[in-house]
C-alpha cells in the first residue's frame, strides 16, 4: 500500500470526510480526471487540482494532530507530480503565489501578455511559418 | 497578425505596462516558460499562468474600455489552450472556483484525495499492477 | 548541528554482500530524502541510491539497481546501503547526503550536508 | 545518456579570474537545478553554489553560478582567485525522477 493512503484516512477522520453525506452532489475532481484521458489535458486539471490541495494543506499547517499526514502527502505529490524536481515545484510555487490584485503584477501580466499567448498552443514549438499557418489559415480574413 | 495582439496592446495602455519600470526585477512567467520544454511540464505551468490572467480579467469585466480587449484574448485563450473545447473549458473554471475555505468543500476534497493521488503520475495509467512495480517495488519495508 | 555518520564499510571478497549504515542528527531525520554517494579512489563523483524521507520511495543508479538496495527507518534515524555481489568496481568511498524536504517548499539545499564517508575495498 | 561534460583542469593566477563549465548532454539545463562542489584532498565534497546561483552561508561572494539555455550549460566562476581555492569541482544535477548525475570533475589549479 502506498504510504499516502493511511495519512489519506487519518485526513478523512480529522475532517469527517468519511460520512455518507460527502459524495451528495457529485465529486470535486474525479469526475473532471475521468473526462481527460490525454496527458496534457490531465496535467492542466492536475495543476488546478494540485493547487488546491497546496492550498489547503497550507490553511491547517500549524494542526499537530494532522502535520505529518500533511507532510507524508505533500512529499508524494512532489515525487508523483512533480518527479522530485524542486524547481518544477518552486516555479509552480511562484506561480501559484502571485497576487492577482497587486497593480505591479497585473503590470507585469499584462506587459507578458503577447509573449504568453503566442506560446499557449502546442503548435507555437514548431516554427513561426507553420504556427502562421496553422492559425491564419483556420481564422476568417479581419 | 493575430488578433489578441492589437487588444493586449490596448490593456498595456490602460494598465500603463509598457513603462520601462515593468521589466523591473524580472519577470512573473516568461522565465518560467522558458525552464520547461516538455509539453506536459509546459501545461502544469501554463494552467496556473491561465487560471491568473481569467482571475485578473474577471477583476476587471465590468470595465467598458477594456471589455472588448479582454473578451477577444479570452476567445483567443478559448482557441488556443482549450482547442475550442467548451467541456474543457468549463471543467477548468469548475476547478479555479473551488473555495478552498468552505467546509463542504475541503471534506470532499479530502475524501477523494486517496484516488487523486493514485492518478497523480503518468505512471498510473499503465494500469495497477506496472505502477505498483513502478513504485511500490522501489520503497523499503514501512 | 547537522550531522552524518556511515559505518560498515571494511574489506570484503568479491561476490560478497555487506550493508553501510548512516546515523543522522541535527535535524527532522523523516523529512529529509538520504542519498547515497561514492567515490572510487582517484576518481570523481557517482551516485549510488536515494531514499525519500516518510515515503521511502527508493531511486538507484541505472548501473546499480537490482544488486543494491536502499531502506530507512526514521525511528532509529538510520539509512543503510545493501550491497551484493559485490565487484572490484564497487571499491569506493561512500558518502551518506542529506537531501531535500520535498514536503517543505522552502527546503534547505540537496546534497548540502555529507558524511565523511565509509570505506569499502572489494578484493581477494 | 545524460551527462554533464566539464574540463578536466583550469588554472588561472592568483586575483584573476576562471570559469568552469558544465555542458547537459541532453535534455535542458534550465529544467533542473544546478549545484557546485568543492572537493580538497582528503576531505568531503562541500557545496559552494545551489539551485543555480545561490551560495551556501559562509561562501564568500567570489563564487558566482549561472545556467546558460543557449548553450544547455552551467557556469561556476572564481573571481579574486586565491590559492586555498586550488581543489577539485564538480557540478551535479539530475534526470528523471530524482536521479542524480555528477559532471566528471575539473582540477583547479592555482599558478
Known amino acids: 500500500q502506498d504510504p499516502y493512503v493511511k495519512e489519506a484516512e487519518n485526513l478523512k477522520k480529522y475532517f469527517n470526510a468519511g460520512d455518507p453525506d460527502v459524495a451528495d452532489n457529485g465529486t470535486l475532481f474525479l469526475d473532471i480526471l475521468r473526462n481527460w484521458k490525454e496527458e496534457s489535458d490531465r496535467k492542466i486539471m492536475q495543476s488546478q487540482i494540485v493547487s488546491f490541495y497546496f492550498k489547503l494543506f497550507k490553511n491547517f499547517k500549524d494542526d499537530q494532530r494532522i502535520q505529518k499526514s500533511v507532510e507524508t502527502i505533500k512529499e508524494d505529490i512532489n515525487v508523483k507530480f512533480f518527479n522530485s524536481n524542486k524547481k518544477k515545484r518552486d516555479d509552480f510555487e511562484k506561480l501559484t503565489n502571485y497576487s492577482v490584485t497587486d497593480s505591479n503584477v497585473q503590470r507585469k501580466a499584462v506587459h507578458e501578455l503577447i509573449q504568453v499567448m503566442a506560446e499557449l498552443s502546442p503548435a507555437a514549438k514548431i516554427g513561426k511559418r507553420k504556427r502562421s499557418q496553422m492559425f491564419r489559415g483556420r481564422r476568417a480574413s479581419q | 497578425q493575430d488578433p489578441y495582439v492589437k487588444e493586449a496592446e490596448n490593456l498595456k495602455k490602460y494598465f500603463n505596462a509598457g513603462d520601462p519600470d515593468v521589466a523591473d526585477n524580472g519577470t512573473l512567467f516568461l522565465d518560467i516558460l522558458r525552464n520547461w520544454k516538455e509539453e506536459s511540464d509546459r501545461k502544469i505551468m501554463q494552467s496556473q499562468i491561465v487560471s491568473f490572467y481569467f482571475k485578473l480579467f474577471k477583476n476587471f469585466k465590468d470595465d467598458q474600455r477594456i471589455q472588448k480587449s479582454v473578451e477577444t484574448i479570452k476567445e483567443d485563450i478559448n482557441v488556443k489552450f482549450f482547442n475550442s473545447n467548451k467541456k474543457k473549458r468549463d471543467d477548468f473554471e469548475k476547478l479555479t472556483n473551488y473555495s478552498v475555505t468552505d467546509s463542504n468543500v475541503q471534506r470532499k476534497a479530502v475524501h477523494e484525495l486517496i484516488q487523486v493521488m493514485a492518478e497523480l503520475s503518468p505512471a498510473a495509467k499503465i494500469g495497477k499492477r506496472k505502477r505498483s512495480q513502478m513504485f511500490r517495488g522501489r520503497r523499503a519495508s514501512q | 548541528e547537522v550531522q552524518l555518520v556511515e559505518s560498515g564499510g571494511g574489506l570484503v571478497k568479491p561476490g560478497d554482500s555487506l550493508t553501510v549504515s548512516c546515523v543522522a542528527s541535527?535535524?527532522?531525520?523523516?523529512?529529509?530524502?538520504i542519498h547515497w554517494v561514492r567515490q572510487a579512489p582517484g576518481k570523481g563523483l557517482e551516485w549510488v541510491a536515494t531514499i525519500s524521507g516518510r515515503t521511502k520511495y527508493m531511486f538507484y543508479s541505472d548501473s546499480l539497481r537490482g544488486r543494491f538496495t536502499v531502506s530507512r527507518d526514521n525511528a532509529a534515524n538510520s539509512v543503510y546501503l545493501h550491497m551484493s555481489s559485490l565487484r572490484g568496481e564497487d571499491t569506493a568511498l561512500y558518502y551518506c547526503?542529506?537531501?531535500?524536504?520535498?514536503?517543505?517548499?522552502?527546503?534547505?539545499?540537496?546534497?548540502?550536508?555529507w558524511g565523511r564517508g565509509t570505506l569499502v575495498t572489494v578484493s581477494s | 545518456n545524460f551527462m554533464l561534460t566539464q574540463p578536466l583542469s583550469v588554472s588561472g593566477y592568483p586575483g584573476k579570474t576562471i570559469v568552469i563549465s558544465c555542458v547537459r548532454s541532453?535534455?535542458?539545463?534550465?529544467?533542473?537545478?544546478v549545484q557546485w562542489f568543492q572537493q580538497r584532498p582528503g576531505s568531503a565534497p562541500a557545496m559552494v553554489i545551489y539551485?543555480?546561483?545561490?551560495?551556501p552561508s559562509g561562501i564568500p561572494d567570489r563564487f558566482s553560478g549561472s545556467v546558460d539555455a543557449s548553450s544547455n550549460s552551467a557556469s561556476l566562476t572564481i573571481s579574486g582567485l586565491k590559492t586555498e581555492d586550488e581543489a577539485d569541482y564538480f557540478c551535479?544535477?539530475?534526470?528523471?525522477?530524482?536521479?542524480?548525475?555528477f559532471g566528471g570533475g575539473t582540477k583547479l589549479t592555482v599558478l
Open positions: 551535479q544535477s539530475y534526470y528523471g525522477n530524482n536521479q542524480v548525475l
Open positions: 541535527g535535524f527532522t531525520f523523516s523529512n529529509y530524502f
Open positions: 539551485e543555480d546561483s545561490h551560495r
Open positions: 547526503v542529506r537531501g531535500y524536504d520535498h514536503s517543505d517548499s522552502n527546503s534547505a539545499a540537496d546534497l548540502l550536508h
Open positions: 541532453s535534455g535542458s539545463v534550465a529544467s533542473h537545478y
